[in-house]
């Protein structure tokens, strides 16, 4: 018969022959022959392979280095890598999460639009008219100006994006 030019899923072509790939969690020891099956070997502790493969070496699990602000989110298995995330108050610098940086704070005049997570930084927004923030914070939103009217007071000093309005008593009409 003609030697194959393509193989089925979970197979690979070698020496004009279709051999079975090794399943996730195992690596290739030797290719199949006309008389023998592909020989695979389980990955050892701290190693993994996450696909059907013909790799001769398993990959080492990622190390979540506490010195870089990292911690383990999910422990690796023979078929999955370890997933790292950042300690509280920090977030990953990249999708691979190889190191962490401190969440940014929103300066006075800006409020938190979206609180940071282990994988994304704080998103700040300028306080619009009618709102203010007088602190640098990683979790405070812009606060609305105090409504003097509801307190039966009048605005004595206008608010800004960094300061609240100052309310005071209404001037009495002289008789």
């Amino acid at each position: 018969p003609e030697p194959p030019t393509a193989c089925r899923e979970k197979q690979y072509l070698i020496n004009s022959q279709c051999c079975s790939l090794c399943q996730p969690g195992q690596k290739l020891v030797s290719d199949c022959t006309e008389f023998t099956e592909t020989e695979c070997l389980p990955c050892g502790e701290s190693e993994f392979l996450d696909t059907w493969n013909r790799e001769t070496h398993c990959h080492q699990h990622k190390y979540c280095d506490p010195n870089l602000g990292l911690r383990v989110q999910q422990k690796g298995t023979s078929e999955t890598d370890t997933i790292c995330t950042c300690e509280e108050g920090w977030h990953c610098t990249s999708e691979a999460c190889e190191s962490c940086v401190l969440h940014r704070s929103c300066s006075p005049g800006f409020g938190v639009k979206q609180i940071a997570t282990g994988v994304s930084d704080t998103i700040c927004e300028p306080c619009p008219v009618g709102f203010f923030s007088n602190v640098s914070s990683a979790f405070e939103k812009c606060h609305p100006w105090t409504s003097c009217e509801t307190k039966d007071l009048v605005v004595q000093q206008a608010g800004t994006n960094k300061t609240d309005v100052v309310c005071g008593p209404q001037d009495r009409l002289r008789a």
């Epitope: 070997l41 990955c43 050892g44 502790e45 701290s46 080492q60 911690r71 383990v72 422990k75």
Partner: antibody, heavy 118, light 106 residues
């Protein structure tokens, strides 16, 4: 800094039980396996078993099955190994150690000497 | 279970001499770890994943091998290398150690 600190030396009578502790710092104990290794005086290293502190899953060398019980307390980052029905051949230094790739060190405790003597 | 046999059991080498310690397994394993132990101290991880030097290990050490046959090599023996070396497999339970190779300085 990663450290594994073991409890102090023990002297026990034959038939007694001993429980050794291994407290880790510098990482969460639930994130890595803890292995226990035996070394009799002047002899080589023997792997006794390991525990996954996250779920308590254990694997023992059949030679130590029934002799050893491994447990862990994630709230105190401490692993324990209990040896029961002690005999003179249990006289040894016992070490706890981590999964090998923790920071490319395989961290080891300082060892706990257990002496079984009547 | 996998039995690891180390060879030689004991050896001595002169400073500057090349040293090779072998570790053979009764069947294929994914990788080998090597540990160094000096009297009265805890073992130290020396080589991981067959060929990677652990932190602080001098570059004169190397590891190689695959399947059931592995080795640790010291390119030029130094006095501080005198110790007992153990191989270990962590592929199949129960994990096992080799019997150890005691390396002395001449």
């Amino acid at each position: 800094e990663v450290q594994l600190v073991q409890s102090g030396a023990e002297v026990k009578k034959p038939g007694a039980t001993v429980k050794i502790s291994c407290t880790v710092s510098g990482f969460n104990i639930k994130d890595y396996y803890i292995h226990w290794v035996k070394q009799r005086p002047g002899k080589g290293l023997e792997w006794m078993g390991r525990i996954d502190p996250e779920d308590g899953d254990t694997k023992y060398d059949p030679k130590f099955q029934g002799k050893v019980t491994m447990t862990a307390d994630t709230s105190t980052d401490t692993a324990y190994m209990e040896l029961s029905s002690l005999r003179s051949e249990d006289t040894a230094v016992y070490y706890c150690t981590t999964s090998y790739y923790v920071g490319t060190y395989g961290y080891w405790g300082q060892g706990t000497t257990v002496t079984v003597s009547s | 279970q996998i039995v690891l046999t180390q060879s030689p059991t004991i050896m001595s080498a002169s400073p500057g001499e090349k040293v090779i310690i072998t570790c053979s397994a009764t069947s294929s394993v994914s990788y080998i770890l090597w540990f160094q132990q000096k009297p009265g101290t805890s073992p130290k991880l020396w080589i991981y994943s067959t060929s990677n030097l652990a932190s602080g290990v001098p570059a004169r050490f190397s590891g190689s091998g695959s399947g059931a046959s592995y080795s640790l090599t010291i390119s030029r023996m130094e006095a501080e290398d005198a110790a007992t070396y153990y191989c270990q497999q962590r592929t199949f339970y129960p994990y096992t150690f080799g019997g150890g190779t005691k390396l002395e300085i001449k």
